[in-house]
């Protein structure tokens, strides 16, 4: 025998109380398959969250965030604050990376510049709290009668040294 | 964490009204659908009905005498009960869940109940 609920469309449900007839989902809930013997409440987007597509009767509202915060979790499911670039959120805010690090995002965490050296190469240009350094040619590249590159003037940080990590 | 305090419960006699308030603490009700079980001694619960977004679904058995109803500004859910019966007689739970209607589903969280005694 054919269950009476399988004929009930998305967007209704199929009333126990009510013979099995299919009754529409209230307002502000979904079901988004047929043959449900409930609706889900809608979510709702408050506070720091606003709505990127409204809840309909077959499918659920979608959330983001407000500016100056973005989306973190399965489907948004908090808002974390926004940073600058050359900064990380920490417990107590935003903050400027460490010397040697740096962030070119509005989020994440102050990622350690990379170590020329490491992959036998010269520092192009310097890292800064926003931009990881850049890796030229390997310092044996650079001999005398090769097309020369001057090396950048150093930042304006003192002793800026591009093999410290914090 | 959500706290669901059901009030209103006693002794009536048969053909009285009741009217048993649910307020949640920790939380609104505002994304929540509200529901009311009952559980008389000796007896499997039953469902009452459930409150979402001005719209009441309830049970098979309570003929028009329930009505359920919600004061958002007090975040208190009510149950109206008129012309009770004896066998009425039951602890009566408030419960919220994301699903609407409750007939079938275990709620998200439940009081701890209050008792309705019809008798004369």
């Known amino acids: 025998l054919q269950d009476p609920c399988s004929n009930c469309p998305a967007g209704t449900f199929c009333d126990n109380n009510r013979n099995q007839i299919c009754s529409p989902c209230p307002p502000n809930s979904f079901s988004s398959a047929g043959g449900q013997r409930t609706c889900d409440i809608c979510r709702q987007c408050k506070g720091v969250f606003r709505t990127r597509k409204e809840c309909s009767s077959t499918s659920n509202a979608e959330c983001d965030c407000t500016p100056g915060f973005h989306c973190l979790g399965a489907g948004c499911s908090m808002c974390e604050q926004d940073c600058k670039q050359g900064q990380e959120l920490t417990k107590k805010g935003c903050k400027d990376c460490c010397f040697g690090t740096f962030n070119d995002q509005k989020r994440g965490i102050c990622r350690p510049w990379t170590n020329c050296s490491l992959d036998g190469k010269s520092v192009l240009v310097n890292g800064t709290k926003e931009r990881d350094v850049v890796c030229g040619p390997s310092p044996a590249d650079l001999s005398p009668g090769a097309s020369s590159v001057t090396p950048p003037a150093p930042a304006r940080e003192p002793g800026h040294h591009h093999h410290h990590h914090h | 964490q959500v706290q669901l305090v059901e009030s209103g419960g006693g002794t009536v006699q048969p053909g009285d009204s009741l009217r048993l308030s649910c307020a949640a603490s920790?939380?609104?009700?505002?994304?929540?659908?509200v529901g009311w079980f009952r559980q008389a001694p000796g007896k499997e619960r039953q469902y009452v009905g459930t409150?979402?977004?001005?719209?009441?679904h309830y049970g098979d058995f309570e003929n028009n005498r329930f009505t359920i109803s919600r004061d958002n500004a007090k975040n208190t859910v009510y149950l109206q009960m008129d012309n009770l019966k004896p066998e009425d007689t039951a602890v009566y739970y408030c419960?919220?869940?994301?699903?609407?209607?409750?007939?079938?589903?275990?709620?998200?969280?439940q009081g701890q109940g209050t008792q309705v005694t019809v008798s004369s």
């Open positions: 409150y979402w977004s001005g719209y009441a």
């Open positions: 920790g939380r609104t009700f505002d994304n929540y659908a």
């Open positions: 419960a919220i869940s994301l699903k609407y209607p409750m007939a079938t589903v275990t709620p998200d969280y």
